[in-house]
Interface confidence: low
Amino acid sequence: RKIPKVGHTFFQKPESCPPVPGGSMKLDIGIINENQRVSMSRNIESRSTSPWNYTVTWDPNRYPSEVVQAQCRNLGCINAQGKEDISMNSVPIQQETLVVRRKHQGCSVSFQLEKVLVTVGCTCVTPVIHHVQ
Amino acid sequence: GITIPRNPGCPNSEDKNFPRTVMVNLNIHNRNTNTNPKRSSDYYNRSTSPWNLHRNEDPERYPSVIWEAKCRHLGCINADGNVDYHMNSVPIQQEILVLRREPPHCPNSFRLEKILVSVGCTCVTPIVHHVA
């Protein structure tokens, strides 16, 4: 697959567009909606039939430096009796997000956009059974 | 990427903060060469809290197409394939960063934007409120 390019040519370029060197783009990392908060149902990671834990990954050369990853607690799912049912599977649900990566090259710094795959939580699924001939 | 001179104290001093505005390469790097190892999953359909995916398109944003999950049921699917309303299907939401064209319509000038997306659904035990 091709590496995606962000710049699009189909836009009529307004006069007010800032000058940008070829092959690069200007990125303001002051985040729009910075103070928006997730209004997820309370403690769903513990109440789910496919519960998960969170781990915070930290990288000072990444913006944002903190990225939270979920890990499913069980291979199976939790049944009504609170026991693990291995006839069902807990599976991770993933979502891509963008981060800015800072790279040091000698006394210079460069910035690169990077896609990061985040595990957001888990869901309980019926397994796919492969029958051996 | 595009190189930017570091502060005069280089190489001893290290600037801990990111500048407010940076120049970045147009190519998006992805260290996981396979963009999404779960590409071929059909969890949306096999889940006990199944969901549909709805297309949200905005040419002023990168990525321009984002998919929103909507839980199909209020309850969860039980072993008999019926909806069990003693359990709840709830969306799993995630804040992600996207690029917003700023000023609008400019091809190579962006600002980071945080948006909330529903990625999928999970089945949870409901919180029961007892009325006194």
């Epitope: - | 071929s40 059909d42 359909n45 549909n52 995916l53 998919w67």
Partner: nanobody, 125 residues
């Protein structure tokens, strides 16, 4: 397993219309997003249109948008491609495909697990 059978392809004059059908049998039809692809002689197979399992999401490639319409009738287990204002460059074998995955992209051929045998559409000038 899902079996797909296309029909409706024929010779038609430029500017004319056609409706292709894709009948599905096998596992639950409604659980599959469906797509149409086409392959002209000597060219690679290319994405034409797709529809989500609920039918409320559709996607088209630029060169057919506004001329072609994809729809599905789950009661009949059939997907349709209604083609209008046909051009000679629309001449190709049209394939119906079903996918077991759904991650927000419609146009990657690799994501489609089940394919029909194809139906020939020829547009004469």
């Amino acid at each position: 397993e899902v079996q797909l059978v296309e029909s409706g392809g024929r010779l038609v004059q430029a500017g004319g219309s056609l409706r292709l059908s894709c009948a599905a049998s096998g596992r639950t039809f409604t659980s599959y997003p469906m797509g149409w692809f086409r392959q002209a002689p000597g060219k690679e197979r290319e994405f034409v249109a797709a529809i989500s399992m609920s039918g409320d999401d559709t996607a088209y490639t630029d060169f057919v948008r506004g001329r072609f319409t994809i729809s599905r009738d789950d009661a009949r287990n059939t997907v349709y491609l209604h083609m209008t204002s046909l051009k000679p460059e629309d001449t190709a074998v049209y394939y119906c495909a079903a996918r077991t995955s759904y991650d927000g992209t419609y146009d990657y051929i690799d994501d489609y697990s089940y394919w029909g045998q194809g139906t020939q559409v020829t547009v004469s000038s």
